[in-house]
Amino acid sequence: GSTVPPMVNVTCSEVSEGNITVTCRASSFYPRNITLTWRQDGVSLSHNTQQWGDVLPDGNGTYQTWVATRIRQGEEQRFTCYMEHSGNHGTHPVPSGNSHHHHHHHH
């Protein structure tokens, strides 16, 4: 099939001791090959500071996955979710405020 770029959604949730978990979800993409990673100040975080979900079918012939990392509360602006799919990339910042999210269709 033809390339379908991912929808990218960034959320954050409070955790203990002044840290928050930021999660980046990519969905509705095809083919299944994708790079999803967190960057701090423009540079990719090491693998051992991130958790990845499997790339799974979402039932529509497309795929979904996620990556998460824990960061200090108040440092959200230094982090971006970096997505690479079919030769295209996108950078997705962390929204301010826990009730907000960034939901963006990457063209």
Epitope: T35, D41, G42, F79, E84, G87, N88
Partner: antibody
Framework: EVQLVQSGAEVKKPGASVKVSCKAS????????IEWVRQAPGQGLEWIGA????????NYNEKFKDRATLTADKSTNTAYLELSSLRSEDTAVYFC??????????WGQGTLVTVSS | DIQMTQSPSSLSASVGDRVTITCRAS??????LAWYQQKPGKAPKLLIY???TLADGVPSRFSGSGSGTDFTLTISSLQPEDFATYYC?????????FGQGTKVEIK
């Protein structure tokens, strides 16, 4: 010291192509995205697109998607912008810049491209 | 695309004056806003990022504020070297867009 050094001024005829280079030094070239911006004479700034020098993956402004090609050569720490089918409105100074997370921290000195018959 | 509107487009001021430039986004960009200073024939120079963080080496007379859609750049006491054009830029989503610029001239 982080430095981005761009190629010299170019004069092109309408319909031609131009390739501008941006040589990076003073940091790990493949770790950071390189962005391209242009500025027409007396005008404001316009984002063209970005490239990941490590992978070659690109992100284009839809306005330039059909005519701009971004590439990078890891062996020489150099990023390139090629713009095809030039027209007079493409006369501008073209800048490269390093993307440091969520802003551009270092810029090249700019390359003037003049399109004239 | 998010449109960035700066005001005023130009202003005349004297050395020692307090100068305020505003930038309005057409949508919520959280705090993902940078300010640049540009002098004729030169590349833009980063002044402020994340709406209010001063870049390295930038004098403390420059300050930024705002979040969401409305942002301000203030020069507390204008110096001779501050006469230039100032641009805001949003980093919430691509295409990254700039304000049209504010030219600060000598009165």
């Amino acid at each position: 010291e982080v430095q981005l050094v761009q190629s010299g001024a170019e004069v092109k005829k309408p319909g031609a192509s131009v390739k501008v280079s941006c040589k990076a030094s003073g940091y790990a070239f493949t770790n950071y995205l390189i962005e391209w911006v242009r500025q027409a004479p007396g005008q404001g700034l316009e984002w063209i697109g970005a490239i990941n020098p490590g992978s070659g993956a690109t992100n284009y402004n839809e306005k330039f998607k059909d005519r701009a090609t971004l590439t990078a050569d890891k062996s020489t720490n150099t990023a390139y912008l090629e713009l095809s089918s030039l027209r007079s409105e493409d006369t501008a100074v073209y800048f490269c810049a390093r993307f440091l997370g969520n802003y551009f921290d270092n810029w090249g000195q700019g390359t003037l491209v003049t399109v004239s018959s | 695309d998010i449109q960035m509107t700066q005001s005023p487009s130009s202003l005349s001021a004297s050395v020692g004056d307090r100068v305020t430039i505003t930038c309005r986004a057409s949508g919520n960009i959280h705090s993902y806003l940078a300010w640049y200073q540009q002098k004729p024939g030169k590349a833009p120079k980063l002044l402020i990022y994340y709406a209010e963080t001063l870049a390295d080496g930038v004098p403390s007379r420059f300050s930024g504020s705002g979040s969401g859609t409305d942002f301000t750049l203030t020069i507390s006491s204008l110096q001779p070297e501050d006469f230039a054009t100032y641009y805001c830029q949003q980093f919430w989503t691509t295409p990254y867009t700039f304000g049209q610029g504010t030219k600060v001239e000598i009165k």
